[in-house]
C-alpha cells in the first residue's frame, strides 16, 4: 500500500512479489459512500501503471489481470473519475517483480595474516531484482558454527571477524553461503579448508640490506615475518631493469645472502611469504627496498685516442682523448683519470689527475719516443692502464686506406666505407675513423669522436654526435704496430643547398689580373659540406649571361686569381657555395676595374 | 573496567519466552565478543551462544533454532531472546565478554575476561 487508501483498497493476487513471467490481479475497490455523490454508477475506477492508464471501470470495483511486468518495481495506482471534478487517488500498491537467487559460485575464503580475521568472498549470479538475504556460515571444530548475514543490496563479500589459530592446523572448516528472497533460496557448495589452507601471511616488513666489509660479494637481505612462516620468494633486479631475479628459500629466518648483485647498482628487493610447502597461498609482495650496492675497482681499460699537432721546428702538442667506462665497467664513480706521460728512451715519467674532462692536452718535445698510460679510478681502486706508444699516424703512405667514401645513411648517421691499404693488408691490427666538425682554421677545441674496427671490416657506421646540415672532417687511419697510414674525406648525414654565398672582402689587381678574397661562410649556413665555389662576373650594365669560374672547396681557401677580365672595364663580381644539394644565392656584389694595358 | 549486567530472568511456563539483557558499562562495547553461559543446579557451566564485534553468531547444539543472539550496540547490550523454553532451559544465564580478537573457541568460558552476575530462569512444566 502505498498511500492512506482511506476511500477504497487496492489489493493484488497471488503477491505483492512475484516471479518473472507470471501474471497478477489486481482489484481496486471502493469503500462504502466513498463513490461519486450523485449516482454510484456514475463511478469511473481507473488504473493506472505508473503515469499510463491501463483499465478502466465504471462501478465500486475494477478487476485487472496484468502480464508481462518487467524485472524491479511496478507502481499502480486506482484513481475516481466523476462528472465535472479532477480525478481523485484511492489507493495503489507496488509490485516487486524478479527471480529466486542463483546458487552462488566460487566460495573462497581468506584470512589474512595470523592475526586476520577470515573474510569470504562468492559470486552472486544474476541480480534477482528483490531484497535477497545472504547468510554465511562457517562450521569447525567443537561441533560449532558461526553464521553471518548479508543485508546489502550487492552482497559477495562478509567478514566474520574470526580469527583462527594454529593450535590444530589440520582441523577442517567448512563454509556455505545461502542465499534467501522472498521468492525462493539456493546455497552455495561447502567449501572445505585448513587453517594452513586459508591464512595467507602478511607480507615481509622492516627489510634491510648489509654490505660486510663494504663488499658486494658480502650482501645479506634480512626482514621480519609472522611467527609461521615456512616460505619466502626474493625477487630483486637493478632499478633501470623491467625483468626480476627470483629465489626461494625454505626457513630463512628473516635472513639470505645474495651472492650475484652487481656494483654500484641500484636494486630493488621484494620479499613474498608462505606458510605451508604445498597448502595456502603467497603474500602480497613486501614494500620495495632500494639500496645501492658498494665500488668495487673498476674492470675493462679505457679506450684512448689522440692528436698531434706541429707547433714549431722542436715542439708538438698532444691532445689525448678517452671514452667514458661503461657503467658495469666502472663499477663506481670514477673520481679522477691518471694520465702518465713517459719519454721511453731517456725514461723520464710526469703523471697527472683529470677531474671532470675526458681529455688532456700537453706540449712535448718533437725528439723522443713518447708513450702515454691513462687509467680510472673511483674510491675502491684503478682500471688497468690503457697504453698507447705516440706516433705520427699518418706517416706510412702505404698503410693509407684507399678509396674512402662518405654516404648518408638514414638521420644523423654516415656509412663510412673503404679498401684496405696497398701495403699487405693482413698487416692491418686495426682501422680508427675520426670524425669532428669541420671549422675552418681547424680549431683544436672542437670535439673529436672516434670509434675503433676490426682488421677485416672496411665500413663503419658512424652516429654518435652526428648533427643534420653539419659538414664533418671524416678520417680513417690504419694501424700496423708503431706505423700508422691515414686517408680523410668530408662527409655530411643530411645537406641542403648553403643559406648564402661567401661575402667578398677584397680584390687586388696584380700583373694584369686580379685576386679575390672571401670570407668563408658561417658553419651554421654551409648546411653540409661545400663542394665547390663560383666566382660570378660580368661587364656592369651588361645584359649578357656572366662568366664563371668553379674552384673546388678546400677548407683553407679563402682566395683566387683570375686573369680574363678585360683592362678599363667595370665589372660586376659575386660569388656562389654548392653542397651536393645544390648552390646557394649570390654572395654580396662587388665592382672592380683592371687598370692593367690591354693586350 | 567493564561491568555486565544480566537482566531479564524470571519463571516461565515450558513453550514460553524470554528475553535476557546483558548490559555494558565502564567502556564501550561495540568491540567485544559477548557470550551467553548457563549453569544448571549441580552441571558444569555451559556455552549457549555468541556474537563478535562484526555481528557473526554461534549456538550450541541444545539452542539452535530456539534462541537468538542480537546486540545494540548504541544502547551498549546484547540479548538473547529465548523461545519454545523448555524446562531443561532451566539455569542461572551468565553473559560474559572478551576485548581482543574472536577466536573460534569463543565456546569456552576461558576464551571470556569479564562476566556477570548471572539472572535467573526457570521453567515449569
Known amino acids: 500500500k502505498i498511500d492512506a487508501c482511506k476511500r477504497g483498497d487496492v489489493t493484488v493476487k497471488p503477491s505483492h512479489v512475484i516471479l518473472l513471467g507470471s501474471t497478477v490481479n489486481i482489484t481496486c475497490s471502493l469503500k462504502p459512500r466513498q463513490g461519486c455523490f450523485h449516482y454510484s454508477r456514475r463511478n469511473k475506477l481507473i488504473l493506472y501503471k505508473f503515469d499510463r492508464r491501463i483499465n478502466f471501470h465504471h462501478g465500486h470495483s475494477l478487476n485487472s489481470q496484468v502480464t508481462g511486468l518487467p524485472l524491479g518495481t511496478t507502481l499502480f495506482v486506482c484513481k475516481l473519475a466523476c462528472i465535472n471534478s479532477d480525478e481523485i487517488q484511492i489507493c495503489g500498491a507496488e509490485i516487486f517483480v524478479g527471480v529466486a537467487p542463483e546458487q552462488p559460485q566460487n566460495l573462497s575464503c581468506i584470512q589474512k595474516g595470523e592475526q586476520g580475521t577470515v573474510a569470504c568472498t562468492w559470486e552472486r549470479g544474476r541480480d534477482t531484482h528483490l531484497y535477497t538475504e545472504y547468510t554465511l556460515q562457517l562450521s569447525g571444530p567443537k561441533n560449532l558454527t558461526w553464521q553471518k548475514q548479508c543485508k546489502d543490496i550487492y552482497c559477495d563479500y562478509l567478514d566474520f571477524g574470526i580469527n583462527l589459530t594454529p593450535e590444530s592446523p589440520e582441523s577442517n572448516f567448512t563454509a556455505k553461503v545461502t542465499a534467501v528472497n522472498s521468492l525462493g533460496s539456493s546455497s552455495s557448495l561447502p567449501s572445505t579448508f585448513t587453517f594452513l589452507d586459508i591464512v595467507r601471511p602478511l607480507p615481509p616488513w622492516d627489510i634491510r640490506i648489509k654490505f660486510q666489509k663494504a663488499s658486494v660479494s658480502r650482501c645479506t637481505l634480512y626482514w621480519r615475518d609472522e611467527g609461521l612462516v615456512l616460505l619466502n620468494r626474493l625477487r630483486y633486479r637493478p632499478s633501470n631493469s623491467r625483468l626480476w631475479n627470483m629465489v626461494n628459500v625454505t626457513k630463512a629466518k628473516g635472513r639470505h645472502d645474495l651472492l650475484d648483485l652487481k656494483p654500484f647498482t641500484e636494486y630493488e628487493f621484494q620479499i613474498s611469504s608462505k606458510l605451508h610447502l604445498y597448502k595456502g597461498s603467497w603474500s602480497d609482495w613486501s614494500e620495495s627496498l632500494r639500496a645501492q650496492t658498494p665500488e668495487e675497482e673498476p674492470t675493462g681499460m679505457l679506450d684512448v685516442w689522440y692528436m698531434k699537432r706541429h707547433i714549431d721546428y722542436s715542439r708538438q702538442q698532444i691532445s689525448l682523448f678517452w671514452k667514458n667506462l661503461s657503467v658495469s665497467e666502472a663499477r663506481g664513480k670514477i673520481l679522477h683519470y691518471q694520465v702518465t706521460l713517459q719519454e721511453l728512451t731517456g725514461g723520464k715519467a710526469m703523471t697527472q689527475n683529470i677531474t671532470g674532462h675526458t681529455s688532456w692536452t700537453t706540449v712535448i718535445p718533437r725528439t723522443g719516443n713518447w708513450a702515454v698510460a691513462v687509467s680510472a679510478a673511483n674510491s675502491k681502486g684503478s682500471s688497468l692502464p690503457t697504453r698507447i706508444n705516440i706516433m705520427n699516424l699518418c706517416e706510412a703512405g702505404l698503410l693509407a686506406p684507399r678509396q674512402v667514401s662518405a654516404n648518408s645513411e638514414g638521420m644523423d648517421n654516415i656509412l663510412v666505407t673503404w679498401q684496405p691499404p696497398r701495403k699487405d693488408p693482413s698487416a692491418v691490427q686495426e682501422y680508427v675513423v675520426e670524425w669532428r666538425e669541420l671549422h675552418p682554421g681547424g680549431d683544436t677545441q672542437v670535439p673529436l669522436n672516434w670509434l675503433r674496427s676490426r682488421p677485416y671490416n672496411v665500413s663503419a657506421l658512424i652516429s654518435e654526435n652526428i648533427k643534420s646540415y653539419i659538414c664533418y672532417e671524416i678520417r680513417v687511419y690504419a694501424l700496423s704496430g708503431d706505423q700508422g697510414g691515414c686517408s680523410s674525406i668530408l662527409g655530411n648525414s643530411k645537406h641542403k643547398a648553403p643559406l648564402s654565398g661567401p661575402h667578398i672582402n677584397a680584390i687586388t689587381e696584380e700583373k694584369g689580373s686580379i685576386l679575390i678574397s672571401w670570407n668563408s661562410i658561417p658553419v651554421q649556413e654551409q648546411m653540409g659540406c661545400l663542394l665547390h665555389y663560383r666566382i660570378y662576373w660580368k661587364e656592369r650594365d651588361s645584359n649578357s649571361q656572366p662568366q664563371l669560374c668553379e674552384i673546388p672547396y678546400r677548407v683553407s681557401q679563402n682566395s683566387h686569381p683570375i686573369n680574363s677580365l678585360q683592362p678599363r672595364v667595370t665589372y660586376v663580381l659575386w660569388m656562389t657555395a654548392l653542397t651536393a644539394a645544390g648552390e646557394s644565392s649570390h654572395g654580396n656584389e662587388r665592382e672592380f676595374c683592371l687598370q692593367g694595358k690591354a693586350n | 573496567q567493564l561491568q555486565l549486567v544480566e537482566s531479564g530472568g524470571g519463571l516461565v511456563q515450558a513453550g514460553g519466552s524470554l528475553r535476557l539483557s546483558c548490559a555494558a558499562s565502564g567502556l564501550t562495547f561495540s568491540g567485544y565478543t559477548v557470550g551467553w553461559f548457563r549453569q544448571a543446579p549441580g552441571k558444569e557451566r555451559e556455552f549457549v551462544a555468541a556474537?563478535?564485534?562484526?555481528?557473526?553468531?554461534t549456538y550450541s547444539e541444545f539452542v539452535k533454532g530456539r534462541f537468538t543472539i542480537s546486540r545494540d550496540n548504541a544502547k551498549n547490550t546484547v540479548y538473547l531472546q529465548m523461545s519454545s523454553l523448555k524446562p531443561e532451559d532451566t539455569a542461572v544465564y551468565y553473559c560474559?565478554?572478551?576485548?581482543?580478537?574472536?577466536?573460534?573457541?569463543?565456546?569456552?568460558?576461558?576464551?571470556?575476561?569479564?562476566w556477570g552476575q548471572g539472572t535467573q530462569v526457570t521453567v515449569s512444566s
Open positions: 556474537i563478535n564485534w562484526s555481528s557473526a553468531y
Open positions: 560474559a565478554a572478551r576485548r581482543s580478537r574472536t577466536s573460534w573457541y569463543a565456546s569456552t568460558a576461558e576464551a571470556y575476561d569479564y
